[in-house]
Each structure stands twice: as C-alpha cells, then as structure tokens.
C-alpha cells in the first residue's frame, strides 16, 4: 500500500485546512492509527492528534478545539483531518504516520501554506497645490503573506516607487505615487489597487485628488461702453476667476467706499439706476486658501445729453 | 494469565511513609505502562499515578502531587509508590493496574491486583 | 479535569432485565471510555473498552455505545452474576477520571 497526501496545503487565515492522509492499501489491509504531528526543521515534532480505529480522534492539549475529522461519511482508510481556524503560527511541516496491518508504517510529510490577506491602507499626501514640483500625492500600503502586489490605477501622469518591509511571517509593500499638481487633475480619480493570491478579487481604495489652485480673475460687463449711461437699469458686473477651494469674492471702489444702493451678491455687483457718481475705479478681489487675485474695471457713465451736445458742436464745428 | 500482587499496606500515622509494591508475573511487563488506583472505603475508584514503560514522564492526580513518587523496576517486574507526609484521606485500599496500551492518553486498565490496604490513623 | 457523571446511582432489577447505565462527559471524549464492573472486596474488571469494544472473556449480554460525551452500558439479560458496582472512566485526557458508579441491586 501508500500513502496519499498533498505536497502543498494552501489555506487563507481563518479558514478550515484540510490535512489530506489516505491509505490506499491492498484488499484486506486495515488502518489501526493515524498520528498527525508538526514537525518544523530544528524542532521537535509536537503531536497534534491520533485517529485511532476505535478509540475515535484524540486531539492533543494544544490543538484542543481545533482539530476535526471531516465530516461523514467516512472512510476507514482515510487519516484526514481538519485544522480549524487556520492561523499564520499553523504554517510549517506536518507529518502522517499511518500504521497498518499486517503491512506496517508509513508516513508522510506536507507543507501548509497560510494565506493571509492584506488589509490595505491608502494615506493621501501633504496638500497639492498647482505650481509645486514633483509631488507625493498617496502612499498605499499592504501587509500580507506573501507579499501583496500594490499597483495604481488613474488617468493622471506620475511616477511610482515602492518598498518592501520583511518581518518574520509576512511582508508589508508601500507604494507611492508621485506628480505635478495642475489644476486639471482636480477630482481625478487614483486608485491603490493591491492583488494577492488569498484574495478573492483586487482590492481597491480610490483617493480624489484636490489640487489647490486660483486663476487669474476678469470682470466682465463693461464689453459695451455705451451701455453705461446715466438712467440705465440693471447695471452689473461679474467678477470671473475659479479656484480649488472655491474661492470668495469681494468688490471695493478704489477711489472711495461703494456709492449707496449698489448691490454686492458673491461675484457679482448690481447697480441701481446709473448716475455720474457710479463712475470709478471698481476692484474685485479673489481669494482662497491658497491664493487671491485683483481686477480692477473703470467704469465711466456717459451722459446722453453732454453726449448729443458733443456731436452738435462737433456737426456746428464741421 | 497476567497476575498483580499489591503489598506494603498496613497501618500508619498522618504524616508518616509507606512504600507500596506490585509484583507482575505472565506477561512482557516491561512492554506495558502501569497505573495505581485507589478506593476509599465505601467510595468509588480514584486514579492516582501512572508511569510509562520506560519510566518516562510520571504523571499524578493532584490530590498526590509532590508527595507520591511512583517507580518500576523493570528488571524485577515490579511497580512501586513511595507515599509520604500521608494524610488521613489518603486511607484508601490501593490497586496497581496495567495499561493496555503505552501512552499517555488513550488506555483501558485491562488487569488489577487485588489491592493494598492503607490505613492512616493516629 | 473531565467530570464523568453516571445515572443512576443504584437501581434495582430483577434477573432476565435488560438494564441500561449511562454515563456523561463533562467535554468530547470522542471514544475513549471504559466500563468496569466491581463487586465488593473485588478488583475493578475491564467490561467494555472504546466505549463499545468488548473485552476477551466478557459476556455477550454486556454492550456499549456512544461516542463524544454521551455513553451507554446495557446488560441484555441480567445475571445473578451481575449485581455488581459499575463504574465508567473516560481517558481522553490526564487525570483519568471515573463516574461515581452505579450500584446493581436484586430487586
């Protein structure tokens, strides 16, 4: 007869191993005991249980509560067990002794293989703002055995670096992606996308990127000039800029306080019916956390009457 | 036919020692581990040492530890419990009995003496 | 330790009375139990071994079963020969332990 087992056992943490020890005997042959041992290079082998054909399963005090037979139906040949719960301490050599009559002993050796998962983690970079250099924008990390592969998945050109960490049962993997922060990465998407043989599928932890960043601000509403005459309604002008964070806006007249009656709503300033005294020197200032900007417009309210007497003299003059 | 005969019994004083034998005859005693068992008057079995074949590893109920020492003398087919600071709960007739099978879990007493019995009394 | 609780503690019986003694472990003890039988100024005698394993020389009428934490002794047909003491013992684990024994009385 001979035994039949697996080289290689692979099992995720927290998962049932199945520890596979068949006899696969001649007619007649009978299986009295099977004795299941840990038996690690340089140490001693430390019994885990005894399938005896009578007794039943014996579990030594250390593995009590952990080891099983499978489930029925049973063969009388099979020595199998179930380590339950496997945990990465289990991982190491495992040795079946199956004792038989009248052929004898045998025995069999095999390697359990713990898979444990990683529980990645992804830790954004120090702010990114438009105008630095080649900046870190995340650094993803995953501790795993064996050692995970971390990779990045985004739209966004940069650069990639990793490290590995050994420690005695697993190995931690960072990776971090660099870039140059411009404003058109802003809610762009970059995704640690870590793989391992004990997972199901990737896992994937996606960060938005922020690029903090102010444009230039202009005003519009002075386009038509002649637009802005004494009497007119529904006067404004607009102040355009755009930023990360969303930037704020405030009107100022640089040469005095704003006349009475005009309206500051955000980016825009509404005027009451013009008169010459709206005319001047008006300010918007943009500004966030990263940035502010100035635009300043001249505003010069033409008077019909002057105007028409103008051209008249001019008519008279030709 | 396996046969186990206790002797060293008798009568001592709460403190006192007393050395117990068993002597084995018709069958390979040395293949086999070998236990005592003892019974207090009128009360059920209570196991009290065990020892390998090879006199590896004894073990003890508690209620004996660090005062019993059990031994075999291979050569003479002969099991012995060296009993000390005796109590009077330690009266009891005591049984040697041998294991079926040489391990440390796992046995069935399958042959018995017929008993010492040890009575501590002041 | 394991606690081997057997019931009842006595019972009476006639001859020809299938008797049935039952024995519970305090944890798994998948099979390893032993009954004996014990009459008075008497060694134990080995009955049943692997909780349904009869031993050499003992009587057919005596039969064991059980496994993990729950065990039975039946004597099919009393004998007068079989009032006795009977007392099972599991050896899982160190301490071997035993029940308290169950007495078998002419009724």
């Known amino acids: 007869g001979e035994l039949e087992t697996s080289d290689v056992v692979t099992v995720v943490l927290g998962q049932d191993a199945k520890l596979p020890c068949f006899y696969r005997g001649d007619s007649g042959e009978q299986v009295g005991q099977v004795a299941w041992a840990r038996v690690d290079a340089g140490e001693g082998a430390q019994e885990l249980a005894l399938l005896h054909s009578k007794y039943g399963l014996h579990v030594s005090p250390a593995y009590e509560g952990r080891v099983e037979q499978p489930p029925p139906p049973r063969n009388p040949l099979d020595g199998s067990v179930l380590l339950r719960n496997a945990v990465q301490a289990d991982e190491g050599e495992y040795e079946c002794r199956v004792s038989t009559f009248p052929a004898g002993s045998f025995q069999a050796r095999l390697r359990l293989r713990v898979l444990v998962p990683p529980l990645p983690s992804l830790n954004p970079g120090p702010a990114l703002e438009e105008g630095q250099g080649l900046t870190l924008a995340a650094s993803c990390t995953a501790e795993g055995s064996p050692a995970p592969s971390v990779t990045w998945d985004t739209e966004v050109k940069g650069t990639t670096s990793s490290r590995s960490f050994k420690h005695s049962r697993s190995a931690a993997v960072t990776s971090e992606f660099h870039l140059v922060p411009s404003r058109s990465m802003n809610g762009q998407p970059l995704t640690c996308v870590v793989s391992h043989p004990g997972l199901l599928q990737d896992q994937r932890i996606t960060h938005i990127l922020h690029v903090s960043f102010l444009a230039e601000a202009s005003v519009r509403g002075l386009e038509d000039q002649n637009l802005w005459h004494i009497g007119r309604e529904g006067a404004m002008l607009k102040c355009l800029s755009e930023g990360q964070p969303p930037p704020s806006y405030n009107w100022t007249r640089l040469d005095g306080p704003l006349p009475s009656g005009v309206r500051v709503d955000g980016d825009t300033l509404g005027f009451p019916p013009l008169t010459t005294e709206h005319s001047g020197i008006y300010v918007c200032h943009v500004s966030n956390e990263f940035s502010s900007r100035d635009s300043q417009v001249t505003v010069d309210v033409l008077d019909p009457q002057e105007d028409s007497g103008k051209q008249v003299d001019l008519v008279s003059a030709s | 036919e396996v046969q186990l005969v206790e002797s060293g019994g008798g009568l001592v004083q709460p403190g006192g020692s007393l050395r117990l034998s068993c002597a084995a005859s018709g069958d390979s005693f040395t293949s086999y581990a070998m236990s005592w068992v003892r019974q207090a008057p009128g009360k059920g079995l209570e196991w009290v040492s065990r020892i390998s074949a090879d006199s590896a590893s004894p073990s003890y109920a508690d209620s004996v530890k660090g005062r019993f020492t059990i031994s075999r003398d291979n050569s003479k087919n002969t099991l012995y419990l060296q009993m000390n600071s005796l109590r009077a709960e330690d009266t009891a007739v005591y049984y040697c009995a041998r294991q079926t099978e040489d391990r440390s879990y796992g046995y069935d007493l399958d042959y018995w003496g017929q008993g010492t019995l040890v009575t501590v009394s002041s | 330790d394991i606690q081997m609780t057997q019931s009842p503690s006595s019972l009476s019986a006639s001859v020809g009375d299938r008797v049935t003694i039952t024995c519970r472990a305090s944890?798994?003890?998948?099979?390893?139990l032993a009954w004996y039988q014990q009459k008075p100024g008497k060694a134990p005698k080995l009955l049943i071994y692997a909780a349904s394993s009869l031993q050499s020389g003992v009587p057919s009428r005596f039969s064991g079963s059980g496994s993990g934490t729950d065990f039975t002794l039946t004597i099919s047909s009393l004998q007068p020969e079989d009032f006795a003491t009977y007392y099972c013992?599991?050896?899982?684990?160190?301490?071997?332990?035993f029940g308290q024994g169950t007495k078998v009385e002419i009724k």
């Open positions: 944890q798994g003890i998948s099979s390893y």
């Open positions: 013992q599991q050896h899982y684990t160190t301490p071997p332990t």
